[in-house]
């Protein structure tokens, strides 16, 4: 079972229209380069088998990755936006720093992984569709986490 | 080409069920899900619920709860939708629609089926 | 249940004509909205999505604005085979919900 206690964001973070505009802004600039609409990295698949109290926890993972694979070494592109985005979603991944699950969670890094993998295998454009979604990940994190 | 194929028109009497198919073509089936949506004479859509062509997985409106079934096979790559304890009021389009079912608009649709429910 | 609320539910314009039908949540939605085109006998046709994405094959006379809980659907032009019915749908929550219509005729 999760530490629920530290698996939880603010609501307050999720109803801030400027930021939120600035994220949904940003994914859908990236989503018009984005020419691979079958392939879905953050939808259905990515949360099977993987129990309601274990999301929040499952999306940090995939919060990370994103930060650290795919906005940062793409951080000069998408501007304006992403200069004011990617401070946002770093200060959630920081609070989410001490979320943690015990017990074994190998289901759900089987799912991150896959997640990453189709990432990797589709290059850049990989990365651009992981952007195109950040308003699918902010939506995950709101549902997940508050 | 990405296309969803219905069934053909169907007349049933008050009480009866009826069962209508989704053949889908064109693309990975279990990739997405399958939505329903109904549409009485002259009236509006009407949204009934949805099934993950990956896992089964449902959703149903409340309002056909206990009396919809929607069901997949992958093998074929059809979505079906049975609806039970038919009554007049039942009696519209029943259309398919491709839905990943999550955050995902409507982008395909089948040509839809004619359900007539009278005695 | 989110409400979705459209208006008008009938608009009278000519070709060539700039139209603009507006979908109201009762909720805020972010941008989870989506705008079809249906015409008579024949199934709903996606327009946009996410608010103001143009559908593959839509033509792009037709535009998507609003967030939250207000939207509108623009038609820069009206061409002859835009005479059919609009419907607003929201994709944020289940229940998925429609708009009652909005049926655009010829004056």
């Known amino acids: 079972a999760p530490i629920s206690s530290h698996c939880r964001l603010d609501k307050s973070n999720f109803q801030q229209p400027y930021i939120t505009n600035r994220t949904f802004m940003l994914a859908k600039e990236a989503s018009l380069a984005d020419n691979n609409t079958d392939v879905r990295l953050i939808g259905e698949k990515l949360f099977h088998g993987v129990s309601m109290s274990e999301r929040c926890y499952l999306m940090k993972q995939v919060l990370n990755f994103t930060l650290e694979e795919v906005l940062f070494p793409q951080s000069d592109r998408f501007q304006p936006y992403m200069q004011e985005v990617v401070p946002f979603l770093a200060r959630l991944s920081n609070r989410l720093s001490t979320c943690h699950i015990e017990g074994d969670d190998l289901h759900i890094q089987r799912n991150v992984q896959k997640l990453k993998d189709t990432v990797k295998k589709l290059g850049e454009s990989g990365e651009i569709k992981a952007i195109g979604e950040l308003d699918l990940l902010f939506m995950s994190l709101r549902n997940a986490c508050i | 080409q990405v296309q969803l194929v219905e069934s053909g028109a169907e007349v049933k009497k008050p009480g009866a069920s009826v069962k209508v198919s989704c053949k889908a073509s064109g693309y990975t089936f279990t990739s997405y899900g399958i939505s329903w949506v109904r549409q009485a004479p002259g009236q509006g859509l009407e949204w009934m619920g949805w099934?993950?062509?990956?896992?089964?997985?449902?959703n149903y409106a409340q309002k056909f709860q206990g009396r919809v079934t929607m069901t997949t096979d992958t093998s074929t790559s059809t979505a079906y939708m049975e609806l039970r304890s038919l009554r007049s009021d039942d009696t519209a389009v029943y259309y398919c629609a491709r839905d990943r079912g999550y955050y995902d608009a409507f982008d395909i649709w089948g040509q839809g089926t004619l359900v007539t429910v009278s005695s | 249940d989110i409400q979705m609320t459209q208006s008008p539910s009938t608009l009278s314009a000519s070709i060539g004509d700039r139209v603009t039908i507006t979908c109201r949540a009762s909720e805020g939605i972010y941008h989870w909205l989506a705008w079809y085109q249906q015409k008579p006998g024949k199934a709903p046709k996606l327009l946009i999505y996410?608010?103001?994405s143009l559908a593959s094959g839509a033509p792009s006379r037709f535009s998507g604005s609003g967030s939250g809980t207000d939207f509108t659907l623009t038609i820069s032009s009206l061409q002859p085979d835009d005479f059919a019915t609009y419907y607003c749908q929201q994709y944020s929550n289940y229940p998925l919900t429609f708009g009652g219509g909005t049926k655009l005729e010829i004056k």
């Open positions: 099934i993950s062509a990956y896992t089964g997985n449902t």
């Open positions: 996410k608010a103001s």
